[in-house]
Every structure is written in C-alpha cells, then in structure tokens.
C-alpha cells in the first residue's frame, strides 16, 4: 500500500550539468494525498540550507503528481551547488534528497568538457 504522506521524489545524489547563460528549470516532484503542502527550495551552504526567498518558482500539475519548479533565467556561474526542496504541512517538514547543479561558465572555459569528463571529473566545472 502506497504511503499517504507527502513524498518528494528527488533521487539521491541526482545531478544536472548545465551551461551558464541558458534557462533551466529545477523540478521537485511532489506527491500528496489531501491538500497541497507549502513547498520551498533552499541552497546548501555547508551544513545549512539557505531558503531561496525571492527566486521565481511555479507549479506544474499532472494527474498523479505535481512539480514545484525553481526557475533559473538564466543560469549564473554562482548557481553552481546543491539544492533541496522541502514540504511543510500541518507542522510536518519533509525534506528531499539534495540535487547538485554543475554549472559550466562558457565564457571562462576555453573548451567545453565532454559529458564523460563532467561525470568522471566534476572538478573541471569549477575552473
């Protein structure tokens, strides 16, 4: 039997490799049984997760799941890092796994690393 608690379906250790200057939507898949919870995004800074108050967010509704979306318009180099979504309802807080954005700054990178390089040597993206 499926749990009727709020579920946030971000996979453990998920990551996205993206280009600075491009638009990007970071999705938090949310499943709930009754009323929609209050969902927020935060960015990890060491052990604390700093709430992203003034960033553009939206909902995309589908029949059995909703997506709470954090918009990057455009992606900036300092968007690099790990993000987490949280759902709050009736005093319960549910936190997702973190998802990491690896941002390539096309201005400073003389040549783009290949996808294989990015997967095996993510430090390339911090040059």
């Amino acid at each position: 039997k499926e749990s009727c608690d709020v579920q946030l379906y971000i996979k453990r250790q998920s990551e996205h490799s993206i280009l600075a200057g491009d638009p990007f939507e970071l999705e938090c898949p949310v499943k709930y049984c009754a009323n929609r919870p209050h969902v927020t995004w935060c960015k990890l800074n060491g052990t604390t997760c700093v709430k992203l108050e003034d960033r553009q967010t939206s909902w995309k509704e589908e029949k059995n799941i909703s997506f709470f979306i954090l918009h990057f318009e455009p992606v900036l180099p300092n968007d690099n890092g790990s993000y987490r979504c949280s759902a709050n309802f009736q005093s319960n807080l549910i936190e997702s796994h973190s998802t990491t954005l690896y941002v390539t700054d096309v201005k400073s990178a003389s040549e783009r690393p290949s996808k294989d390089e990015m997967a095996s040597r993510p430090w390339l993206l911090y040059r």
Epitope: N35, P37, H38, V39, S58, S66
Partner: antibody, heavy 121, light 108 residues
C-alpha cells in the same frame, strides 16, 4: 449555506492603499485554495492571488510586491492588502474558493458578489 | 505563462440551437481546465471543472471535452438564460493562473 461576502472597496488615490475583506460562511477557508480575481469594467477576468491550505501564497507579476493575501482562521476571513495602487488596478474584486486536492482539480466553485475598487485622483 | 485563446469572440445563435465554444492553450494544460459563465452584474459561475466534469447543479445540456491544448464547451440546446459570457481558465502551470479573454454568446 456556503457563501462569500466581500467588503472594503472604495475610491482611493494613485499610490494609496486599501484592504479588502472576504467573510466566508458554511465552510472553513483554511481547507481550500482561496483566491482573489478581478475584473475591470467591460474586460475579462484576471487572477490576482491565492493562499493555499498550508498558507503558501502566490501572485502574478502585475501585483507581486504590492498586494498581500492573508487569512484569519478564527474569523474565517480572507484579506487582500493592496498598496501602491495604480489606475490599472481599478476593477471589481471577487474572492473565490477553489478545491484542489490530491492532484485533482475542482475549479472555483464559490464566488462572492464582488467589491468595487476605483483608483483615481 | 500559459495563454488561453477563446473563439469565437462572439457567437450569435437562437434558442434551441447548439453552441460550440473553443479554448486553445499555448501549451499543454493536461485536463486542468475549467469553464465559467458570467451574466452582466453577476459573479462568474463554475460550469465545468477538470475539462469535462459538470459542477454541482449545472444542467446536462452543458458539456466539456478536450485535453492538452484544445478544449470545447458545448451547450446542446440553448435556453434563453444561457446567453452570457463564457470563460475558460487553466490551473496546470501556475502562477499565474490564467483565463481566456471570453466568448460572448448572444441571441441572434
């Protein structure tokens, strides 16, 4: 009887503020998405804001930073605080109830009669 | 933002005729679409929710269909009280929640 009654409309100068109220009866507003929708004379419907059961609030770009939606559960009332008003905010303002639970959508099924806001010098 | 385009802007028909109103979304809204009727000096009234479900108390002559980007409101046989303005509204990608510009249904 399920009912919504708006109040607080009136004439205000550009740059001024106004607070609209919506008193609900026959149901509990904190169990629903509660909206403000406006309509300028002879024009279509324009969504203004929503507050969800969890207290989350959302606005379109046209009013974000100027309007604030809130509710008082003890009074079963919904509010819209409108600041920095412009001539373009002149409209009839309706509050409406919407059911949206478990990823199903039920539409805005209960509406108030509306309250008129006129922004003019 | 999702733009809803309703057509025609005005529809002139006689009582007893069939009315077909269209609402087209700029991108898919799944079935998260509602239809409202509004008469002069009155608040809107919910007719159809979730694209095809009749709201409580709405006569069977009103029906909704469609999913994705193309939706239709059909009134099978017009009654005198059906002449009004009709709006579609989406709640699929939001904010903002958006309404169509309306279709005016008038007596021919």
């Amino acid at each position: 009887e399920v009912q919504l009654v708006e109040s607080g409309g009136g004439l205000v100068q550009p740059g001024g503020s106004l607070r609209l109220s919506c008193a609900a009866s026959g149901f509990t507003i904190s169990s629903y998405d509660m909206h403000w929708v406006r309509q300028a004379t002879g024009k279509g419907l324009e969504w203004v804001s929503v507050i969800g059961p969890a207290g989350d609030t959302y606005y379109p770009g046209s009013v974000k930073g100027r309007f604030t939606i809130s509710r008082e559960n003890a009074k079963n009332s919904l509010y819209l605080q409108m600041n920095s008003l412009r001539a373009g905010d002149t409209a009839v303002y309706y509050c409406a109830r919407e059911g949206m639970a478990a990823h199903n959508y039920y539409g805005m099924d209960v509406w108030g009669q509306g309250t008129t806001v006129t922004v003019s010098s | 933002e999702i733009v809803l385009t309703q057509s025609p802007a005005t529809l002139s028909l006689s009582p007893g005729e069939r009315a077909t109103l269209s609402c087209r979304a700029s991108q898919s809204v799944s079935s998260y679409l509602a239809w409202y009727q509004q008469k002069p000096g009155q608040a809107p009234r919910l007719l159809i929710y979730d694209a095809s479900n009749r709201a409580t108390g709405i006569p069977a002559r009103f029906s909704g269909s469609g999913s994705g980007t193309d939706f239709t409101l059909t009134i099978s046989s017009l009654e005198p009280e059906d002449f009004a303005v009709y709006y579609c509204q989406q709640r699929s990608n939001w904010p903002p929640i958006t309404f169509g510009q309306g279709t005016r249904l008038e007596i021919k």
